[in-house]
C-alpha cells in the first residue's frame, strides 16, 4: 500500500495473507469460513511452493494469539483466467478446514448486486504489499482509502486506454495506491467486499495509471457455484 | 459490435448554429469518453474537445472554445455537438469517435455546409 | 500545441514495394506518466479514419504484420513492407501525450 498507514490491529477480520514456502505472497479475504478470495495470478507466482492462508494476523512476523496458517485444500482460479491478462483475475482456495471464527477473523460480506459504485465512492484497501517505490515490505497491515474513479476516465488512452471492462472497476492512484503484493486483497466500500486487486505488473502510485479491482458482483454466481 | 451512427448532411446559413449527434450502440456508453474533431475539404483532422459521458464533464481545444458545446444523453447513448455563429471556415466533415482503445471507433462523419 | 510534421506529403509506390512514413513532433512526446501516445490513422477517401499503430509501435487488432511503427521521443517512422491495393489513401500520425491532442498534416500513399 502506497501513501497508507498502519492499520487498527485486527480491525479487518476477513483479511488474509495468501503465502507460498510461508512468505506472504497476496493479499486474500475471507468471504466464508472455509474460504478464501484472491487474485488467480498469485498461484502463478506460486510456482510449485506450498501455498497457504494466513488469518487473524497483524503483523506477519510477531506472534499473535489470533494468528493462524491454514492448509490450502483446493485452489479453484476462475476458468476464464490467463496469464496475459487481467480479465477473471478470481481465485477461491478452500482452506484445509473451516476457518476458528473470533473478532480477529471474520469473514466478510460481499456485494451480490451487479451495480457500480458511485464514482467518488471512498474504500478502503488493505494488504502487507510495498509501502515504497523501493519496494519496503511492512511487517504489519496498512490500508489506505480510495476514491472510486469513473470506468470512461479509467478507459482513456493515457489511463487503461480501453482496458477496463464492466467486470472491473477503478480506483484514483494519486500517490495512494495498492502496489505489488497487495494483489488479491479486498476493497471495501460501507463495509462490503465490491473489488479484489488485480495482480497485473502495473505502475503503482501514478494517478494516470488507477488500480484495477475485479467487480466480485460480477461473479457472483461463479463464487456460488464454488462455494455450493 | 461496437458503432457510432452520426446523423446526416446539414447545410446552414451563416450566422447559424447546428447541433449534430452521435449515437453509440454495442457497448455500455458511458464507459467510454466520445471526442470530435473536424476535417476540412482536402485538409487534416483537428481534435475538438471530448465529453465524459457519467458527469458531462468536458475538455475543449482552445481554438474552438465558444464555437462547440458538447453535450450528452445518456438515456439514448448520444452524443451531441453544437456548432455557433457559423461561417464558411467551419464547413467541414465533424467525426466523433470513442476513446479506448485510442481512437480505434469512428462515426461515419457528418458533413456540415454553411452558405448563404 | 505540440506540431506533428509529416514527410513526405506524397508517397508514390509501386505495390509490393517497401513505404517508409516520417512524423516529428515540434516537443516530445512522452507523457508524464512514461508512455508514449503516437498513434497512425489510415483514412481511405470518403471513408473515416482507421486506427493502425498505437504507443509508437503496437498494431492494433486485425492490422496486418506489414505495418510497423518505431520511434521515440520526437522522431516517428511507420513503415509498410510490402505496399497493396488496399493500403492506399491519406496517412496521418497523432499525438495523444499533450492537450490537446494533435494530428499531423498527412502522407499520400498513391500508385507510381
Known amino acids: 500500500i502506497l501513501g497508507g498507514r498502519e492499520a487498527e490491529a485486527h480491525a479487518r477480520p476477513y483479511m488474509a495473507s495468501v503465502q507460498v514456502n510461508g512468505e506472504h505472497l497476496c493479499g486474500g479475504v475471507l468471504v466464508a469460513e472455509q474460504w478464501v478470495l484472491s487474485a488467480a495470478h498469485c498461484l502463478e507466482d506460486a510456482a510449485d511452493g506450498k501455498v497457504q492462508v494466513l488469518l487473524g494476523a497483524h503483523s506477519l512476523s510477531q506472534p499473535e494469539p489470533s494468528k493462524r496458517l491454514y492448509d490450502v485444500l483446493r485452489a479453484v482460479p476462475h476458468p476464464d483466467s490467463r496469464p496475459d491478462t487481467i480479465d477473471h483475475d478470481l481465485l477461491l482456495l478452500q482452506l484445509s478446514e473451516k476457518a476458528t471464527l473470533g473478532p480477529a477473523v471474520r469473514p466478510l460480506p460481499w456485494q451480490r448486486v451487479d451495480r457500480d459504485v458511485e464514482p467518488g465512492t471512498l474504500c478502503d484497501v488493505a494488504g502487507w504489499g510495498i509501502v515504497s517505490h523501493a519496494g519496503r515490505r511492512p511487517d504489519r497491515l496498512q490500508h489506505v482509502l480510495l476514491p472510486v474513479l469513473d470506468r470512461a476516465t479509467c478507459n482513456r488512452r493515457t489511463h487503461h486506454d480501453g482496458a477496463i471492462t464492466q467486470r472491473m472497476m477503478c480506483a484514483e492512484s494519486n500517490r495512494r495506491d495498492s502496489c505489488k503484493g497487495d494483489s488479491g486483497g479486498p476493497l471495501v466500500c460501507g463495509g462490503v467486499l465490491e473489488g479484489v486487486v488485480t495482480s497485473g505488473s502495473r505502475v503503482c502510485g501514478n494517478r494516470k495509471k488507477p488500480g484495477i479491482y475485479t467487480r466480485v458482483a460480477s461473479y457472483a454466481a461463479w463464487i456460488d457455484s464454488v462455494l455450493a | 459490435e461496437v458503432h457510432l451512427q452520426q446523423s446526416g448532411p446539414e447545410l446552414v446559413k451563416p450566422g447559424a448554429s447546428v447541433k449534430i449527434s452521435c449515437k453509440a450502440s454495442?457497448?455500455?456508453?458511458?464507459?467510454?469518453?466520445k471526442n470530435w474533431m473536424r476535417q476540412r475539404h482536402g485538409e487534416s483532422l483537428e481534435w475538438i474537445g471530448d465529453?465524459?459521458?457519467?458527469?458531462?464533464?468536458?475538455n475543449y481545444n482552445q481554438k474552438f472554445k465558444g464555437k462547440a458545446t458538447l453535450t450528452v444523453d445518456k438515456s439514448s447513448s448520444t452524443a451531441y455537438m453544437e456548432l455557433r455563429s457559423l461561417t464558411s471556415e467551419d464547413s467541414a466533415v465533424y467525426y466523433c469517435a470513442r476513446e479506448g482503445p485510442s481512437f480505434a471507433y469512428w462515426g461515419q462523419g457528418t458533413l456540415v455546409t454553411v452558405s448563404a | 500545441d505540440v506540431l506533428m510534421t509529416q514527410t513526405p506529403l506524397s508517397l508514390p509506390v509501386s505495390l509490393g514495394d517497401q513505404a517508409s512514413i516520417s512524423c516529428r513532433s515540434s516537443q516530445t512526446i512522452v507523457h508524464s506518466n512514461g508512455d508514449t501516445y503516437l498513434e497512425w490513422y489510415l483514412q481511405k477517401p470518403g471513408q473515416s479514419p482507421n486506427l493502425l499503430i498505437y504507443?509508437?509501435?503496437n498494431r492494433f487488432s486485425g492490422v496486418p504484420d506489414r505495418f510497423s511503427g518505431s520511434g521515440s521521443g520526437t522522431d516517428f517512422t511507420l513503415k509498410i513492407s510490402r505496399v497493396e491495393a488496399e493500403d492506399l489513401g491519406v496517412y496521418y500520425c497523432f499525438q495523444g501525450s499533450h492537450v490537446p491532442p494533435t494530428f499531423g498534416g498527412g502522407t499520400k500513399l498513391e500508385i507510381k
Open positions: 454495442g457497448y455500455t456508453f458511458t464507459d467510454f469518453y
Open positions: 465529453i465524459n459521458p457519467n458527469n458531462g464533464g468536458t
Open positions: 504507443k509508437v509501435s
